[in-house]
Interface confidence: low
């Protein structure tokens, strides 16, 4: 493979070798060069699986906000706009990462933490158990 | 809102009210008790708007593997089985938080970035637009 | 799919050589750091060692310094770990882990194979 040898202008640490703690640049920089079309779409409303957002808040977690999907039904919208019950909404959920403050109330350390959150709602065939 | 004091254990920081750059540990808590739904789920092949899940790899990026979604078709599955163009298969997107190093190939510096993924496909309603 | 499979665990005696591979596959292999990582009867998980991408840095737990080596073959897929003059102490499960960019930090390893050393 390549060699990749470590940059001279890295910041010095305690321990190269394996730090347990590293510096983090909050000045984020966003790769998303379009705005961001879940915020200004109406999917949540047009969907055959509708969701509703939740404002989930936590001040000693970065980012603060994050928004959770609840889907509104059981089943899904069909083509007369009634609820059908032989599909279902379920939610699509990702691991995130966020940054939690550890000590908690301090303004400058953090520690890593995975979440899982539910970005949205989509429709599926149930799986039926057949009783014998 | 509620004063929250400052922990008095607080790693010392030259900007005590703006840091740019936080101390981060990386003991990762994962606060998911079960398994990830999403990774043992079928949800992708059941659904009404199917996707394909892509493997966007980046060995200088935390996560460093990313799985992104490709909604397979234009339109929906109907009962039938069959790609009903008179629904949409859209997907639903996510801003989520990645680490990536900098300055490049330092073991210990990182900044926070934003990417836009897509975590999986809703079936919607289109919009249509009547001419005049 | 990631996957990492151990193997070249057994009983030895002390003073003994063990050497461990892992064969992993489902990711590009000379792109990340791997890891041997053990875990002791009753006790937590432990790290033993530390490969670069290119095999060109090793770093090792103070406990094994001198005795135990840690090498890659990115042609084949495999990580290794030459285990000599080994002490009761070594006795552990050994799980192989590929590294992130994170340090310590691994998102797979391997069901592990055990090492017992016991007279």
């Known amino acids: 493979g390549i060699t990749i040898p470590r940059n001279p202008g890295c910041p010095n640490s305690e321990d190269k070798n394996f730090p347990r703690t590293v510096m983090v640049n909050l000045n984020i920089h966003n790769r998303n060069t379009n705005t961001n079309p879940k915020r200004s779409s109406d999917y949540y409303n047009r969907s055959t699986s509708p969701w509703n957002l939740h404002r989930n808040e936590d001040p000693e977690r970065y980012p603060s906000v994050i928004w959770e999907a609840k889907c509104r039904h059981l089943g899904c919208i069909n083509a007369d706009g009634n609820v059908d019950y032989h599909m279902n909404s379920v939610p699509i959920q990702q691991e995130i990462l966020v940054l939690r403050r550890e000590p908690p109330h301090c303004p400058n350390s953090f520690r890593l933490e995975k979440i899982l959150v539910s970005v949205g709602c989509t429709c599926v065939t149930p799986i039926v158990h057949h009783v014998a | 809102g509620i004063t929250i004091p400052r922990n008095p254990g607080c790693p010392n920081s030259e900007d005590k009210n703006f840091p740019r750059t936080v101390m981060v540990n990386l003991n990762i808590h994962n606060r998911n008790t079960n398994t990830n739904p999403k990774r043992s789920s079928d949800y992708y092949n059941r659904s009404t708007s199917p996707w394909n899940l892509h493997r966007n790899e980046d060995p200088e990026r935390y996560p460093s593997v990313i799985w992104e979604a490709k909604c397979r078709h234009l339109g929906c599955i109907n009962a039938d089985g069959n790609v009903d163009y008179h629904m949409n298969s859209v997907p639903i997107q996510q801003e989520i938080l990645v680490l990536r190093r900098e300055p490049p190939h330092c073991p210990n510096s990182f900044r926070l970035e934003k990417i836009l993924v897509s975590v999986g496909c809703t079936c919607v309603t289109p919009i249509v637009h009547h001419v005049a | 799919q990631v996957q990492l499979v151990e193997s070249g665990g057994g009983l030895v005696q002390p003073g003994g050589s063990l050497r461990l591979s892992c064969a992993a596959s489902?990711?590009?292999?000379?792109?990340?750091?791997m890891y041997w990582v053990r875990q002791a009867p009753g006790k937590g998980l432990e790290w033993v060692a530390e490969?670069?991408?290119?095999?060109?840095?090793?770093y090792y737990v103070d406990s094994v310094k001198g005795r135990f080596t840690i090498s890659r073959d990115n042609a084949k897929n495999s990580l290794y770990l030459q285990m000599n003059s080994l002490r009761a102490e070594d006795t552990a499960v050994y799980y192989c882990?590929?590294?992130?960019?994170?340090?310590?930090?691994?998102?797979?390893w391997g069901q592990g194979t055990l090492v017992t050393v016991s007279s």
């Open positions: 882990a590929k590294g992130e960019i994170l340090p310590l930090y691994f998102d797979y």
């Open positions: 489902g990711f590009t292999f000379s792109s990340y750091g």
């Open positions: 490969i670069k991408q290119d095999g060109s840095e090793k």
